[in-house]
């Protein structure tokens, strides 16, 4: 899915109002020094691509994130604010339902959620490029469409 035409500000608002708090709840009890953020993103559509991948794609050692509250709210936000997103996710949802029986919090899942928090931080702020190049807010000017 191409996240270029999402309403980034609406997704950011959804993240800050609820999703961020759910991620913190998931990570509660984890030392803040435990994980190094190794996954990065270069602009807002790219950040959403990485966020979708880490949130919904099963990985070795962590197959259960998609049923978490933050994942369901992320899916809802993308469905509402990214035109055509839900249609692309129908097959993926069927596969998810078959694959996941129960929620298990492993160290690998905690690490993955820590990576997610880092990706969302990058999504939420202007891109750190030196003067003369565009930042996230210029991306907004070019690609930001309102969908109601």
């Amino acid at each position: 899915y191409d996240f270029t035409n999402c309403d980034f500000e609406k997704i950011k608002a959804a993240y800050l109002s609820t999703i961020s708090k759910d991620l913190i709840t998931y990570m509660s009890g984890t030392k803040s020094t435990e994980f190094n953020n190794t996954v990065s993103c270069s602009n807002r559509p790219h950040c959403l691509t990485e966020i979708q991948s880490l949130t919904f794609n099963p990985t070795a050692g962590c197959a259960s994130l998609a049923k978490e509250m933050f994942a369901m709210k992320t899916k809802a936000a993308l469905a509402i604010w990214c035109p055509g997103y839900s249609e692309t996710q129908i097959n993926a949802t069927q596969a998810m339902k078959k694959a996941r029986k129960s929620k298990v919090t492993t160290n690998k899942c905690l690490e993955q959620v820590s990576q997610l928090q880092g990706l969302w931080r990058r999504f939420n702020r202007p891109l750190l490029k030196q003067q003369g190049s565009s930042d996230y807010k210029d991306d907004d000017d070019k690609h930001h469409h309102h969908h109601h």
């Epitope: 608002a13 803040s32 020094t33 953020n37 928090q117 939420n124 202007p126």
Partner: antibody, heavy 119, light 107 residues
Framework: EVQLVQSGAEVKKPGSSVKVSCKAS????????IEWVRQAPGQGLEWMGV????????NYNENFKGRVTITADKSTSTAYMELSSLRSEDTAVYYC????????????WGQGTTVTVSS | DIVMTQSPDSLAVSLGERATINCKAS??????VTWYQQKPGQSPKLLIY???NHYTGVPDRFSGSGSGTDFTLTISSLQAEDVAVYYC?????????FGQGTKLEIK
């Protein structure tokens, strides 16, 4: 608990440079941006620039016309701000601050470093 | 650069009364506004992020509102410990910029 501890007060001559350090503890240093803000005596806050310690990316306030350089050393969890071609109006308290968990604010601040520029 | 202009520059309010500080951006900053409190001789402290979200441990008497270019910080019932200078900051576009500050005192 995250802590940012800055280097001590400096007295500098006009035209010289100053390098202020900011050592972070209690969190993963490379995961969060570090910004630098200064405050002249009796004045407001002025944003100087920011660094991503994870990859070294920076963004500077162009008002400083290339006089400011921000760096980070991941091995010691320390950020540095160097200001060159000092003048008397650079006399200020210099603060470092760390990005919060959401990427929309700076929640932990250093204690400040007083830099006095005087001949 | 985006200019953030606060009003008033200083404000005197009686204990228990409401204090309101305004911040106007020279262009839209969406909801990317943060409020900081700075007491004499101390570093700034984060109060409110993304217009209206309370930072951990910030009392409920502090609230933020607004969007686009006009923002407000409200203290519903002023306490003695709220005497400080308050700054808004836009987090929408580099360079990040602060308002000039509003000094809040007790009447």
């Amino acid at each position: 608990e995250v802590q940012l501890v800055q280097s001590g007060a400096e007295v500098k001559k006009p035209g010289s440079s100053v390098k202020v350090s900011c050592k972070a503890s209690g969190g993963t240093f490379s995961n969060y941006l570090i910004e630098w803000v200064r405050q002249a005596p009796g004045q407001g806050l002025e944003w100087m620039g920011v660094i991503d310690p994870g990859n070294g990316d920076t963004n500077y306030n162009e008002n400083f016309k290339g006089r400011v350089t921000i760096t980070a050393d991941k091995s010691t969890s320390t950020a540095y701000m160097e200001l060159s071609s000092l003048r008397s109006e650079d006399t200020a308290v210099y603060y470092c601050a760390r990005e919060d968990n959401t990427g929309t604010a700076f929640d932990y601040w250093g204690q400040g470093t007083t830099v006095t520029v005087s001949s | 650069d985006i200019v953030m202009t606060q009003s008033p520059d200083s404000l005197a309010v009686s204990l228990g009364e409401r204090a309101t500080i305004n911040c106007k951006a020279s262009q839209s900053v969406s909801s990317d506004v943060t409020w900081y409190q700075q007491k004499p001789g101390q570093s700034p402290k984060l109060l409110i992020y993304y217009v209206s979200n309370h930072y951990t441990g910030v009392p409920d008497r502090f609230s933020g509102s607004g969007s686009g270019t006009d923002f407000t910080l409200t203290i519903s019932s002023l306490q003695a410990e709220d005497v400080a200078v308050y700054y808004c900051q836009q987090h929408h576009r580099f360079p990040l910029t602060f308002g000039q500050g509003t000094k809040l005192e007790i009447k």
